[in-house]
C-alpha cells in the first residue's frame, strides 16, 4: 500500500482566526467540506498526511520527485516522494536531495566545479531509466542557481522555466530541457488526459500563455477521442 | 521589502465578471505558489484558489470551481482570477498570498493560510443581486 513508502509527516493545523478549511488539488471528487481533491480520502495516512499527486518533478517539493509509490508500479499514479539521500540509489537527477545528483545510479555530493561537466554525461545515462520522466535534469534550486546567470533564450538548456526569459517556458525536447515560447491563442496544446502523461513526451509543449487555457477546437468535438485537437483559447 | 498589491475588486450585479490582480515586488516570486483567500463580514478567512510555483497545477475551492480562474505570469510577478458568474455569496475582502515551495508537500499544503508568508492588504468584492 502506499502507506508503507510514505513519511510520517504531519500537517500544521490551521491557528485561528485564518481557519480556512484544508485543501487538495482541484478535481472532480470532495474529500473535504468546500475543497476538492482527486481520488477522495484514497491516500489517507494515520496521521493526517495526503501525499500529493503529481505529473512531473516540479510539482513536488524541493525534497521530493515525482515518481510510482511502487516498484513497477502503474505509472498513471504518481505521488511525490521523499528524495534520496547521499549513496542511494537513483535514475535521474530529481531523485537526490538538493546539494546531490545522479551518477552511475547513485546519489553524490554536486562538487560544483564539476557538475557542469557531470551533468552532460549523465543526460545520456538517464535517458529511458524512469517511467515518469525523460529528463537527465534536476530542478534542484541549489544547483540551477549557480548554473545560470542570465535567463535563457530560446533553445537554450534549463533545469525550469524560472530559467528562461519571458514568453519562455522550460520544456523536454529528446532528453535535455531547453527554453521553448509559451504557446499563443489557437496554437496547438497538449491536454494530459492521465497523471504521468508529461513523462511520456519526447517534444514537450510549453503551456498555454496567460488568459489562455489548453481547450478541445471547436470543429473538433466530432471526432474521435483519440484525434482530438487542443488549441490554447481564451477563457 | 517584499509586497503583495491586489487590484481589480469593485462592485458587480449577480452573473457578472471581475478580474483580480496581484502584483509582487522586492523579490522574485517564482518559486511561491499565489493564491487568493477571501473573508466575508463575520467570516473566517476562507481559501480560493491557488496556482502553483511550476504553473501546471491549480487548486480551487468547491464553492469556485468553474466559475474562478486563477492564473500567473511570473516574468510579470503578477497572478490574475477571472471570477465569473459571480453571486452575492461571493462578497467578500479578496487577499493575495504567497506560500514558499515547501521541502515536503501534502494535498492540503495550499489551502493552509498557515503556510502563506507574504500577504495583501485585500481588495473589496461586491456582488449585488
Known amino acids: 500500500t502506499l502507506n508503507s513508502v510514505l513519511n510520517s509527516n504531519a500537517i500544521k493545523n490551521l491557528p485561528p482566526p485564518l481557519g480556512g478549511a484544508a485543501g487538495h488539488p482541484g478535481s472532480a471528487v470532495s474529500a473535504a467540506p468546500g475543497i476538492l481533491y482527486p481520488g477522495g480520502n484514497k491516500y489517507q495516512t494515520i496521521d493526517n498526511y495526503q501525499p500529493y499527486p503529481c505529473a512531473e518533478d516540479e510539482e513536488c517539493g524541493t525534497d521530493e520527485y515525482c515518481a510510482s509509490p511502487t516498484r513497477g508500479g502503474d505509472a498513471g499514479v504518481q505521488i511525490c516522494l521523499a528524495c534520496r539521500k547521499r549513496r542511494k540509489r537513483c535514475m535521474r537527477h530529481a531523485m537526490c536531495c538538493p546539494g546531490n545528483y545522479c551518477k552511475n545510479g547513485i546519489c553524490v555530493s554536486s562538487d560544483q566545479n564539476h557538475f557542469r561537466g557531470e551533468i552532460e554525461e549523465t543526460i545520456t545515462e538517464s535517458f529511458g531509466n524512469d517511467h515518469s520522466t525523460l529528463d537527465g535534469y534536476s530542478r534542484r534550486t541549489t544547483l540551477s542557481s549557480k548554473m545560470y546567470h542570465t535567463k535563457g533564450q530560446e533553445g537554450s538548456v534549463c533545469l525550469r522555466s524560472s530559467d528562461c526569459a519571458s514568453g519562455l517556458c522550460c520544456a523536454r525536447h529528446f532528453w535535455s530541457k531547453i527554453c521553448k515560447p509559451v504557446l499563443k491563442e489557437g496554437q496547438v496544446c497538449t491536454k494530459h488526459r492521465r497523471k504521468g502523461s508529461h513523462g511520456l513526451e519526447i517534444f514537450q509543449r510549453c503551456y498555454c500563455g496567460e488568459g489562455l487555457s489548453c481547450r478541445i477546437q471547436k470543429d473538433h468535438h466530432q471526432a474521435s477521442n483519440s484525434s482530438r485537437l487542443h488549441t490554447c483559447q481564451r477563457h | 521589502e517584499v509586497q503583495l498589491v491586489e487590484s481589480g475588486g469593485g462592485s458587480v450585479q449577480a452573473g457578472g465578471s471581475l478580474r483580480l490582480s496581484c502584483t509582487a515586488s522586492g523579490r522574485p516570486f517564482d518559486n511561491y505558489a499565489m493564491a487568493w483567500f477571501r473573508q466575508a463580514p463575520g467570516k473566517e478567512r476562507e481559501f480560493v484558489a491557488a496556482?502553483?510555483?511550476?504553473?501546471?497545477?491549480?487548486h480551487y475551492a468547491e464553492s469556485v470551481e468553474g466559475r474562478f480562474t486563477i492564473s500567473r505570469d511570473n516574468a510579470k510577478n503578477t497572478a490574475f482570477m477571472q471570477m465569473s458568474s459571480l453571486k452575492p455569496e461571493d462578497t467578500a475582502v479578496y487577499y493575495c498570498?504567497?506560500?514558499?515551495?515547501?521541502?515536503?508537500?501534502?494535498?492540503?499544503?495550499?489551502?493552509?493560510?498557515?503556510?502563506?508568508?507574504?500577504w495583501g492588504q485585500g481588495t473589496q468584492v461586491t456582488v449585488s443581486s
Open positions: 496556482i502553483s510555483w511550476s504553473l501546471t497545477r491549480t
Open positions: 498570498a504567497a506560500a514558499p515551495r515547501p521541502k515536503r508537500i501534502s494535498v492540503r499544503y495550499f489551502s493552509t493560510s498557515s503556510n502563506y508568508d507574504y
